[in-house]
């Protein structure tokens, strides 16, 4: 992909970013008593930037080398590297910084595809797993719950580790871990269902390490519009991986004649990707893209980080909005195929299903729509935000809010259309999901703007935790519970099976509207919280060690 090949060049705002980074370097040069010469902002041949820390030269290949500092009392003051043109300057390698970072982003995105491919391969062969192990629906629910709960619990732990230790090592270990567990789980004997449950829990832990840390590395490789673009690519991996997971699950099962083989594909790819991450992803410093180099040290405790995040209103509101998205996608993903099947039974275009899988065709269509709308949503959201940033500083949360509120309308229309037209319902699903998914990458970008680099992994983890806890961990069960409750008070008929589930699912658009409100609330505080984060970053770049953040 061209956009990955040379990301910094492809992004429309690349020149603007360069100028912005240049201004920041000059400003810091002045702050650090460089005599106002701006030597810290000096650029070497081919445009190698000297980091704000003054002790590193970032080469075009993305590598970092120690820069010579002049002896005390010389013009090359401590904390300000010699200019690239001056004596003693090291000439950077003539390779492309954009290409190195682009490759890193590509590998990280590939890893995210695999994360979701692995997760949804299991979903793709879930009926076979249920059949083989004799798993009841409550057992299948347990598999899902254990995965989400372990993911939720592990996310904050990896957030803490990700802000303090080598991130690419944690990432690779996480991938190697879930790959090994998934591969092993394909050999679990029929009588050890509890081992399968445990393996899903362990996979959840392994995948939490990735989902929590990878976006923060992208955040440290890029800024502004390029970062939005790269996060869009990264988050497009979710619908792509999910769709590929279903496809892999069913096609490998058919090709091999045994569902066990489906669980052996993603681990092999995972091992390769884990190795590529170790080799190709640079060990970036936190705040690297913000030209902060070595200066950002995690001096704060986890408790202080948590307090700061909870006080960050943009972060809190955007996290609650993310939970609303998660609630809706979790519930719709589980129940819409069955709802549409029941709609067809009412319309007399399908038979009542007594032997599952019920609505297998609808699941397939819904899966394909989700995959495509995921892509369309991410692209639309990123494009809209980019355009709106020219008009307002609050573009990010406002685009999300509009997407959410628009999505709620079309989700409501699904239940109106389904009574008479399945095609109409699918069109509403298509538009509704596109709008709902448009905020994926933008939400991640909001987080990058309002949270300082040394807290980003913790912030991503906490957001992941809350969005699962308040979102998809409970929504499928809540919808099922409400549907059963309605059915208990009505007569047993295909019409009421359809209506009760429809009424229960009507909770989703209300939650999505609530999410839109949370994004509007984010818009209120976004500018001030972003400015505060930038101010804190600038403070962190100054010499005094005891900067309170």
């Amino acid at each position: 992909m061209m956009c990955l090949e040379c990301a910094s060049a492809a992004a429309g705002g690349a020149e603007e970013e360069e100028a912005d980074a240049e201004r920041r370097r000059r400003r810091r040069g002045a702050q650090r008593g460089a005599g106002g010469s701006g030597c810290c902002g000096a650029r070497g041949a081919g445009g190698a930037g000297v980091s704000a820390a003054g002790d590193e030269v970032q080469t075009l290949s993305g590598s970092v080398r120690r820069a010579p500092t002049g002896p005390p009392g010389t013009p090359g003051t401590p904390g300000c590297a010699a200019t690239a043109k001056g004596p003693g300057a090291q000439q950077p390698k003539p390779a492309s910084l954009g290409r190195g970072r682009g490759a890193a982003a590509a590998i990280l995105s590939l890893g995210n595809v695999l994360n979701y491919l692995d997760r949804y391969t299991v979903a793709g062969v879930l009926l076979d797993i249920q059949q083989h192990f004799g798993v009841k629906d409550r057992g299948a629910g347990l598999l899902q719950s254990v995965f989400i709960c372990s993911f939720m619990v592990a996310a904050p732990i990896f957030g803490y580790l990700g802000d303090r230790f080598n991130r690419k090592v944690i990432l690779s270990c996480g991938i190697f871990f879930w790959s090994a567990v998934t591969f092993s789980s394909s050999f679990i004997p029929q009588q050890y269902f509890w081992l399968l449950v445990a393996s899903r829990g362990l996979v959840g832990i392994g995948e939490a390490s990735y989902s929590t840390i990878a976006p923060t590395i992208i955040g440290d490789l890029f800024t502004k519009n390029t970062r939005t673009l790269m996060l869009s690519v990264f988050y497009f991996a979710i619908p792509l991986g999910s769709g590929l997971g279903y496809i892999t699950g069913s096609s490998v099962k058919q090709a091999a004649g045994d569902w066990h083989w489906a669980l052996r594909v993603s681990p092999v790819l995972g091992m390769i990707t884990g190795t590529l991450i170790l080799i190709l992803v640079p060990a970036t410093k936190r705040g690297h893209a913000d030209q902060l180099g070595d200066q950002l040290k995690a001096r704060t405790s986890w408790l202080r980080d948590m307090k700061a995040l909870i006080r960050n209103r943009s972060y809190v509101f955007s996290s609650l909005a993310t939970s609303a998205v998660s609630f809706a996608t979790g519930a719709l993903g589980m129940w819409i195929p069955l709802y549409l099947h029941r709609a067809q039974v009412v319309q007399k275009t399908a038979e009542t299903c007594n032997s599952p899988p019920c609505g297998a065709k609808d699941s397939l269509i819904f899966g394909a729509i989700t995959c495509f709308t995921g892509f369309l949503g991410v692209v639309t959201g990123a494009g809209a935000t980019r355009w709106c940033r020219l008009k307002t500083q609050r573009a990010d949360p406002l685009v999300c809010a509009v997407g959410m509120l628009g999505s709620a309308i079309f989700i409501c229309l699904i239940f109106v259309a389904a009574k008479s037209s399945i095609v109409g319902a699918y069109i509403c699903i298509f538009v509704g999901e596109t709008l709902l998914f448009s905020n994926w990458a933008i939400t991640a970008d909001i987080l990058m703007y309002v949270v300082i680099p040394t807290r980003r992994a913790t912030a991503v983890a906490l957001q992941s935790f809350t969005s699962h806890l308040l979102g998809d961990a409970g929504s499928p069960y809540l919808i099922g519970f409400i549907s059963d409750l309605i059915r208990q008070s009505t007569k047993d008929s295909p019409l009421w099976e359809f209506l009760s589930l429809g009424y229960a699912l009507m909770l989703c658009p209300f939650v999505v509207v609530l999410g839109g409100m949370f994004f509007l609330a984010t818009a209120l505080f976004f500018v001030s919280d972003r400015a505060r984060a930038e101010q804190q970053v600038n403070q962190l770049a100054m010499p005094p060690a005891s900067v309170k953040v």
């Epitope: 059949q131 083989h132 192990f133 009841k136 409550r138 029929q190 269902f193």
Partner: antibody, heavy 125, light 107 residues
């Protein structure tokens, strides 16, 4: 004590129908998978049909030899499982056993931990 | 469908002897094999589940082993009540299938 008692057997003509019933007691029937297994005179055992519990949508599975002719069903309120046999053939002559699958709440074993005493079905003209 | 083959079809032993009954699957089935005993004019009863797991109330002289395609039911010191037909059953995949049985008779 777990008990499975089959009824409804007898002599019928080819092409006719018969409904076997299995009354159960001593365990939580609504959570348990049930099967019918048959044994032709002097022959081995053959699994016929399986019905899962309501937590598995009461899904039914059948042996290829009887698919489309036999229907397994259950009535949780009466703790009974049934086998409706239509278009009976000579080769359906056998002792039909009602069997229970061992239950583990979240999942179930496919083996049979309890068997009824069996009921004889003879298909002959 | 998975086909199970039991050998020998008939096995003649004297009480007190130890015997091994074999069951072979047409494809690898891990440990998803179960053994049943059917005495004359009685219903079958479960002896061993998942190749080697013992069942409550079944004498300890019955044991099972094997994995993949080859399985063994061992009876240590056969007693008079053990002379019956023994069936293996696979639960690796539907349809559930039984072996043709091995008849254990008095020599």
């Amino acid at each position: 004590e777990v008990q499975l008692v089959e009824t409804g057997g007898g002599l019928v003509r080819p092409g006719s129908s018969l409904k076997l019933s299995c009354a159960t007691s001593g365990f939580t029937f609504s959570d348990t998978w049930m099967s019918w297994v048959r044994q032709a005179p002097g022959k081995g055992l053959e699994w016929v049909a399986l019905i899962k519990d309501k937590n598995s949508n009461s899904e039914a599975n059948y042996a290829e030899s009887i698919k489309g002719r036999f229907t397994i069903s259950r009535d949780d309120s009466k703790s009974r499982v049934y086998l409706q046999m239509n278009t009976l053939r000579d080769q359906d002559t056998a002792t039909y056993y009602c069997t229970r699958h061992e239950d583990f709440y979240y999942y179930s074993g496919y083996y049979f931990d309890y068997w009824g005493q069996g009921v004889m079905v003879t298909v002959s003209s | 469908d998975i086909v199970l083959t039991q050998s020998p079809p008939t096995l003649s032993v004297t009480p007190g002897e130890s015997v091994s009954l074999s069951c072979r699957a047409s494809q690898g089935i891990s440990t998803s094999i179960h053994w049943y005993q059917q005495r004359s004019n009685e219903s079958p009863r479960l002896l061993i589940k998942y190749a080697s797991q013992s069942i409550a109330g079944i004498p300890s002289r019955f044991s099972g082993s094997g994995s993949g395609t080859d399985f063994i039911l061992s009876i240590n010191r056969v007693e008079s009540e053990d002379f019956s037909v023994y069936y293996c059953q696979q639960t690796y995949s539907l349809p559930l299938t039984f072996g043709p049985g091995t008849k254990l008779e008095v020599k």
